[in-house]
């Protein structure tokens, strides 16, 4: 005979686990049902009635099974320097990233607590390390026979043109100015040419950061007396 | 067997504040909730809040926000309850009572009659 | 705030009759209710949780029912240290909040 599918709550066999989605409650010593993501147990098992789930209220969440008494708080809205990149619902946290320009530098479980602008590079300083949502521009001085003229946290030093007849030479801020009108070379890919050329600048943009999907867990969750019930093992 | 024993009576006057406590023996005192419930005399029982002593999470009524300030010293398993700017309408016995959810509570401490009065 | 209405306020009962007590909220709890029994100068105690689930240790002659807004707490057969009063709560809606009580007397 096949063996009987036990239904919560039950006694687990000595040794033995509860199920995918149960938890063991010490208090009643059985195997009980979890709640699902977006639910919160209102009513604990006993020996001879299951949980009670409920849904969570406005604001909170739960985003694993789980037999928490409360749900989660959702985090406070994004600040200004922020964009929302997933809602709080029943199921999720809200999730905060820095808008573009910025970097993010106080981080948290998902999202980010504490946005910074990326740094601007002056005249004279190129981008050396390009920022990214976790870290900020890092600026060099531009190298001889390099400049930047522009105050940014995207343009790199660019080699100075190179003139048949120099008219002024470039430094680590301004580039190079020719006599000529037809230098002999420009490193500045479209730069217009008129008596004293001006380079056009290409403009890097900031990549959107990407928001992060690692599951929450709640160290700040009021547990019961059982093991921890968000974030635990068991789908 | 779970027990929940609170401080003495108090007599205070209007303005002044008061401090009950409400120390836990024989559970998992950072594993349940504590609630504060008040009673004036010969009047039925009103919710005040509670505290999570696990993550110190509290809760409080609306009507006693900011008077009501709820604290636990989990290394005395002791629960406070302090209610501030007293008023004569706050005679009352007050309890704490324990619960594992947060909505029934199934063990009480013996009461603690606070007397406000000029 | 939900308001919670308990109907007697009293009663009188001899020893060995079926007494019912019932309680009304001003909304849907969704069987989110408790009952308490609180004896003079004592703290109250736990009888039913969840409109019907027993707490341990209480008599089974104690029962509870009801849904919706309509709520019952019966004795089926009382006992001498049965005479208290009573009182429902709810747990659907922050703040909780209790009934008025229902004292039951000896007759």
């Known amino acids: 005979l096949p063996a009987q599918v036990a239904f919560t709550p039950y006694a687990p066999e000595p040794g033995s686990t509860c199920r995918l989605r149960e938890y063991y409650d010490q208090t009643a010593q059985m195997c009980c049902s979890k709640c699902s993501p977006g639910q919160h147990a209102k009513v604990f098992c006993t020996k001879t009635s299951d949980t009670v789930c409920d849904s969570c209220e406005d604001s909170t969440y739960t985003q694993l099974w789980n037999w928490v008494p409360e749900c989660l708080s959702c985090g406070s809205r994004c600040s200004s320097d922020q964009v929302e990149t997933q809602a709080c619902t029943r199921e999720q946290n809200r999730i905060c990233t820095c808008r573009p320009g910025w970097y993010c530098a106080l981080s948290k479980q998902e999202g980010c607590r504490l946005c910074a602008p990326l740094r601007k590079c002056r005249p004279g300083f190129g981008v050396a390390r390009p920022g990214t949502e976790t870290s900020d521009v890092v600026c060099k001085p531009c190298a001889p026979g390099t400049f930047s003229n522009t105050t940014s946290s995207t343009d790199i030093c660019r080699p100075h043109q190179i003139c048949n007849v120099v008219a002024i030479p470039g430094n680590a801020s301004m580039d190079a100015v020719c006599t000529s009108t037809s230098p002999t070379r420009s490193m500045a890919p479209g730069a217009v040419h008129l008596p004293q050329p001006v380079s056009t600048r290409s403009q890097h943009t900031q990549p959107t950061p990407e928001p992060s999907t690692a599951p929450s867990t709640s160290f700040l969750l009021p547990m019961g007396p059982s093991p921890p019930a968000e974030g635990s093992t068991g789908d | 067997q779970v027990q929940l024993v609170q401080s003495g009576a108090e007599v205070k006057k209007p303005g002044a504040s008061v401090k009950v406590s409400c120390k836990a023996s024989?559970?998992?005192?950072?594993?349940?909730?504590i609630h504060w419930v008040r009673q004036a005399p010969g009047q039925g029982l009103e919710w005040m809040g509670w505290?999570?002593?696990?993550?110190?999470?509290?809760k409080y009524h609306e009507k006693f926000k900011g008077r009501v300030t709820m604290t636990a010293d989990t290394s005395t398993s002791t629960a406070y309850m302090e209610l501030s700017s007293l008023r004569s309408e706050d005679t009352a016995v007050y309890y704490c009572?324990?619960?594992?959810?947060?909505?029934?509570?199934?063990?009480w401490g013996q009461g603690t009659l606070v007397t406000v009065s000029s | 705030d939900i308001q919670m209405t308990q109907s007697p306020s009293s009663l009188s009962a001899s020893v060995g009759d079926r007494v019912t007590i019932t309680c009304r909220a001003s909304?849907?709890?969704?069987?989110?209710l408790n009952w308490y029994q609180q004896k003079p100068g004592k703290a109250p105690k736990l009888l039913i949780y969840y409109t019907s689930r027993l707490h341990s240790g209480v008599p089974s002659r104690f029962s509870g029912s009801g849904s919706g807004t309509d709520y019952t707490l019966t004795i089926s057969s009382l006992q001498p240290e049965d005479f208290a009063t009573y009182y429902c709560q709810q747990f659907n809606t922050l703040p909780w909040t209790f009934g008025g009580g229902t004292k039951v007397e000896i007759k």
């Open positions: 009572a324990r619960s594992r959810a947060t909505g029934y509570f199934d063990y």
């Open positions: 505290i999570y002593p696990g993550n110190v999470i509290t």
């Open positions: 909304q849907d709890i969704r069987n989110y």
């Open positions: 024989d559970y998992s005192f950072t594993n349940y909730y």
